[in-house]
Amino acid sequence: EVEKTACPSGKKAREIDESLIFYKKWELEACVDAALLATQMDRVNAIPFTYEQLDVLKHKLDELYPQGYPESVIQHLGYLFLKMSPEDIRKWNVTSLETLKALLEVNKGHEMSPQVATLIDRFVKGRGQLDKDTLDTLTAFYPGYLCSLSPEELSSVPPSSIWAVRPQDLDTCDPRQLDVLYPKARLAFQNMNGSEYFVKIQSFLGGAPTEDLKALSQQNVSMDLATFMKLRTDAVLPLTVAEVQKLLGPHVEGLKAEERHRPVRDWILRQRQDDLDTLGLGLQG
């Protein structure tokens, strides 16, 4: 065991290359200089190291950087990132979006590991808010990212970042999350004209209050039933029959098919039968 701690003659690594895949674990430990490894991290991913060999390389980096790796090393970790623990990652200070992208790419197509979750949290906290470029990147890799956040976390999303949000990114959001996101979207899109504004705001309307729905009803938006069914019940209830008719336009006929479902069911029960009869749909209050 003792002689294994010394690097055999002629085996000292002068660069990180394919010859190292034939090194035993103890030889890697003894013959690869940690500083050399750190400067040539970008080469590691091109070499088919075994998991056991990667463990050794990680150990060497841990010894060299006990306080956490510098970003120059982190950016080139590649598959070695999969060996990191959340505890390792909490020591890092990742500020570059390129570094974040590089590490997310390693995990692409997989469920989010605790390591990736920790990395993202560290990155976002370091930036102080979910800026547009970060959000763009995160939702590209993880479409459900926004809807996995708490309302408080969502409150750190600036309105300007809302431009990065695609309709599918909101598919799994709950009502409270939409309550937080809607005012931000309203602010972000406020300078758009009527029809363009509606296209952008539509996905967020599950958080819209009654007064905004009343305003939309004056703009000939022709809201489809799928969007209407996602509106807050408490926001829909005060709307008059005339306002709902204007809001839905030609889609108003779809109310009949949804008359047993919320929010349509509850809205119908709040209306005068005479008013409902003006729609000619046979709705019974």
Partner: nanobody, 115 residues
């Protein structure tokens, strides 16, 4: 493979209580928003409550003050404590995990409240 398994449903009298559990396996649920939804016959699935990864919660107006959600991250389990049950709470209750990569649903557990 990710699985959500609900349990704890059953029949109860008006004013009674039930505690639903949802056990998540195959991934780390602490990364996800864990929610409860319910669906009564002939109606759409509706939101009941959420437990967020920072420990906060939110509730539908119809259950506020009666239902409480909590989670045990160590056991990858989320709970729904339902008190002062009403006939209108009768439904199939579904557990939902809204994770960054996708959302998952359980098979549901039936809750019946009779007067």
């Amino acid at each position: 493979q990710v699985h959500l398994v609900e349990s704890g449903g059953g029949s109860v009298q008006v004013g009674g209580s039930l505690r639903l559990s949802c056990a998540a396996s195959g991934y780390n649920a602490s990364i996800c928003r864990m929610s409860w939804y319910r669906q009564a016959p002939g109606t759409e699935r509706e939101f009941v409550s959420s437990s967020y990864r920072d420990g906060s919660q939110s509730y539908a107006d119809s259950v506020k003050g009666r239902f409480t959600t909590s989670r045990d991250s160590a056991k990858n389990t989320v709970f729904l404590q339902m008190n002062s049950l009403k006939p209108s709470d009768t439904a199939m209750y579904y557990c939902n995990a809204a994770c960054p990569w996708r959302a998952y649903w359980g098979q549901g557990t039936q809750v019946t409240v009779s007067s």
